[in-house]
């Protein structure tokens, strides 16, 4: 079948990086600048993606593969193939419509992206708080209060968890 297909369709012989040029008796022509074909037998080459504005070139376009973009420093990718760039915030913050805002008490974010999440409620697992949480770090849970030696006291547990994604305005 492949052999008969290539006999009937000369375009199938055109490798990646070329296109089957109908204007030139179906000769395989190289993709023009700023275009590519990633598979053989194509009748046109695709236009290379341009990494413009806040998008930064991660991989340059070649005759056989499209350019790949990431985001300029200070931004991070969102969506398939980095379709959008969203600004980074600092650890201990989350991005709101009004910009980067500090995590409110009882929540933390240890990344430059995403939302503030509630501290772990150690008592739900029958444990005590070994290390207090901060805006940037979750609490560290330790042994249950019953496991502590007599006279030892645990740190006061954190405030009850709340729905993530809110922040002081």
């Amino acid at each position: 079948f492949e052999r008969t297909r290539s006999l009937q369709d000369p375009c199938s012989n055109c490798p990646a990086g070329t296109f089957c040029d109908n204007n030139r008796n179906q000769i395989c022509s190289p993709c023009p600048p700023n275009s590519f074909s990633s598979a053989g037998g194509q009748r046109t080459c695709d236009i290379c993606r341009q990494c413009k504005g806040v998008f930064r070139t991660r991989k340059e376009c070649s005759s056989t593969s499209n350019a790949e973009c990431d985001c300029t420093p200070g931004f991070h990718c969102l969506g398939a193939g980095c379709s959008m760039c969203e600004q980074d915030c600092k650890q201990g913050q989350e991005l709101t419509k009004k910009g980067c805002k500090d995590c409110c008490f009882g929540t933390f974010n240890d990344q430059k992206r995403g939302i503030c999440r509630p501290w772990t409620n150690c008592s739900l697992d029958g444990k005590s708080v070994l290390v207090n949480g901060t805006k940037e770090r979750d609490v560290v849970c330790g042994p249950s209060p019953a496991d502590l030696s007599p006279g030892a006291s645990s740190v006061t547990p954190p405030a009850p968890a709340r729905e993530p994604g809110h922040s002081p305005q």
């Epitope: 990494c51 413009k52 504005g53 806040v54 998008f55 930064r56 070139t57 340059e60 300029t72 420093p73 200070g74 931004f75 969203e86 600004q87 910009g99």
Partner: antibody
Amino acid sequence: QVQLQESGAGLVKPGASVKLSCKASGYTFTEYIIHWVKQRSGQGLEWIGWFYPGSGSIKYNEKFKDKATLTADKSSRTVYLELSRLTSEDSAVYFCARHDNQYFDYWGQGTTLTVSS
Amino acid sequence: DIQMTQTTSSLSASLGDRVSISCRASQDISNYLNWYQQKPDGTVKLLIYYTSRLHSGVPSRFSGSGSGTDYSLTISNLEQEDIATYFCQQGNTLPWTFGGGTKLEIK
């Protein structure tokens, strides 16, 4: 064609504040970051910070975060740099530049600030 | 912060010469290296981005090369209008940083 035009500098007294303007034209204003860059006499270039009209995002070089404030007016396609508590160290040429990809593709002509009593 | 070092602060050459200006980063900047030209009147223009890509309208006598931490700008056939100061800049990591500049003069 892309054009950036700075204005607002001049002779200012120590301790005062000054607001510099960068008016952009020739492209879609909301698609590109605008940077401010400082150049002291006969010296190199220092990045102050950026304003991204697309999202209102602002980023400062830590060195300038207590000195500079960036704002913008989308309707007039202008980005502002306000410098506070001026000293002789702030005397410099201030450039705005457009950001594309990871470089500064178009620059204004610069505006000269002199801080002196 | 990434330090950008241009070891030669001034350079003297004759018209028609091939001139190279070097720039070193304090850490790998993954080819995110750009070159700017500042004319004596203060005007700044982008020449080369991403190590070796020529910005639109820049004459082909300008070229760039390098990788990792070491980069260079070459002017293959020096012309009078190339008299300027040349700055490198890294676009890999915030804050953006520039080299100290290399002033090019005619012998």
